[in-house]
């Protein structure tokens, strides 16, 4: 882009690509203006990441206007949640995480009535992703599936999400979990472990569907380091 991104000011509801270390520029929305009274977030916007429904505080230098940057950053990406994010920013830009409750004064998300509690195990958790982890560093970069052929095939296309499931650990189910989960969805609270354990993957599967009976193998990415905690809330989970 020709002009410097640093001077750009955003307002509530603006659509952007947000950059966090170790991650591609991610489709996002400005949800809250900087709150000068809060030192840690002064000059930082709270952004909502499409696809994963996580939030983080980012400065303007890490934000890029969506329409202007769409061609540059809007290319398909293997990261879990990225494809869903591209879809949501185009088709459902006002989407909110289930059970979302704003805890800050300058929120621009209209909340006429509280949304229903999060679906049990829906995984649309919100936390202050900036430098936080969920107490065991689970916000890690997901591993892209190996491409088996040129046309090919990242697994996990819709309609093929439950293929090849022997690797998948069975999540504990918590019939009572909905209310507890909804209570943890405040903007700045780190994810408590019991909620994390009971959650299913944080987003619907993305990527290409498998030619049947193809075995899934995954490569680790080089960037899977401590930077991972600064991710847009994308949980690494094994392929379903």
């Amino acid at each position: 882009m020709s002009r410097s991104n640093r001077q750009k000011e955003y307002k509530c509801g603006d659509l952007v690509f947000a950059k966090m270390k170790g991650y591609p520029h991610w489709p996002a929305r400005i949800d809250e203006m900087p709150e000068a009274a809060v030192k840690s977030t002064a000059n930082k916007y709270q952004v909502f990441f499409f696809g994963t429904h996580e939030t983080a505080f980012l400065g303007p230098k890490d934000l890029f206007p969506y329409e202007e940057s769409k061609e540059k950053f809007g290319k398909p990406n293997k990261r879990k949640g990225f494809s869903e994010g591209l879809w949501e920013i185009e088709n459902n830009p006002t989407v909110k995480a289930s059970g979302y409750q704003s805890s800050q004064k300058k929120s621009c998300v209209e909340e006429p009535e509280p949304e229903p509690e999060a679906a049990e195990g829906d995984g649309d958790k919100k936390g202050n992703a900036e430098g936080s982890s969920d107490e065991e560093g689970k916000l890690v970069i997901d591993e892209p599936a190996k491409e088996k052929n040129e046309k090919g095939a990242l697994k996990r296309r819709a309609g093929d999400l439950l293929e090849d499931s022997p690797k998948r650990p069975k999540e504990a189910e918590n019939p009572e979990g909905e209310e507890k989960e909804a209570a943890t969805l405040e903007v700045e609270r780190p994810l408590p472990m019991e909620v994390e354990k009971n959650s299913t993957p944080s987003e619907p599967g993305s990527g290409r569907g498998p030619p049947q009976e193809e075995e899934e193998e995954e490569d680790e990415e080089e960037e899977a380091t401590k930077e991972d905690a600064e991710a847009p809330g994308i949980r690494d989970h094994e392929s379903l």
Epitope: P76, S83, E84, L86, W87, E88, N91, S98, P116, A118, A119, G121, D122, G123, D124, K151, A153, R156, R157, A158, G159, D160, L161, L162, E163, T200, P201, E203, P204, G205, S206, G207, R208, G209, P211, L240
Partner: antibody, heavy 120, light 106 residues
């Protein structure tokens, strides 16, 4: 704005082939991640998924109908096709096409449906 | 194949009621569940995707929840425009619809 419109022969004789056309606008079947699904609904009954054609031709069929169905597309004219190789009276139904993403977010936009009646 | 069962084929409710429609899968579908609304004129709309995410333009009185094999759609304040048949659909392994639940006004 995304729109889809189905068209077909209306009435067809048993054991004949049928070709249904879905003409759409607002998206392209050459775009990565895009698909068109075909769904039908016999009178007074529920929805039944038939087939999905993806942008890369890695298509999917309902196993119970697979031997009688074929999907294809004409990306330049924004059309998708459902071919039923030999129709039976049980194929009488309203046929819908719907836009789908491989991003697993459902059949996002649907056509209005076209009635196919199989009758001698 | 994954079977989807909507045990209630029809239900009557009054305007303003809170209505819950349930759906059960024959196996764990990991939240890969959508809800659709079909109006009497045949028009079909996606309401909720991935168990609980509201599709664009859908009123917030609609909500979805569930996990594993059991899912539900709730309409919190029934309006005349909600008269329709509601279908659940799994997309974990191919696509399968439930049999539908027809919602009528008392």
């Amino acid at each position: 704005q995304i729109t889809l419109k189905q068209s077909g022969p209306g009435i067809v004789q048993p054991s004949q082939p049928v070709r249904l056309t879905c003409t759409f606008s607002g998206f392209s079947l050459s775009t990565s991640g895009i698909g068109v699904a075909w769904i039908r609904q016999p009178s007074g009954k529920g929805l039944e998924w038939l087939a999905t054609i993806w942008w890369d031709d890695d298509n999917r069929y309902n196993p119970s109908l697979k031997s009688r169905l074929a999907v294809s597309k004409d990306t330049s004219n924004n059309q998708a096709f459902l071919n039923i190789i030999t129709v039976e009276t049980a194929d009488t139904a309203i046929y819908y096409c719907a836009q789908i993403y491989d991003y697993a977010v459902g059949f996002a936009y649907w056509g209005q449906g076209t009635l196919v009646t199989v009758s001698a | 194949d994954i079977q989807m069962t909507q045990t209630t084929s029809s239900l009557s409710a009054s305007l303003g009621d809170r209505v819950t429609i349930s759906c059960r899968a024959s196996q764990d579908i990991s939240n890969y569940l959508n809800w659709y609304q079909q109006k009497p004129d045949g028009t079909v709309k996606l309401l909720i995707y991935y168990t609980s995410r509201l599709h664009s333009g859908v009123p917030s009185r609609f909500s979805g929840s569930g996990s594993g094999t059991d899912y539900s759609l709730t309409i919190s304040n029934l309006e005349p425009d909600d008269i329709a048949t509601y279908y659940c659909q799994q997309y974990g392994k191919l696509w399968t619809f439930g049999g539908g639940t027809k919602l009528e006004i008392k």
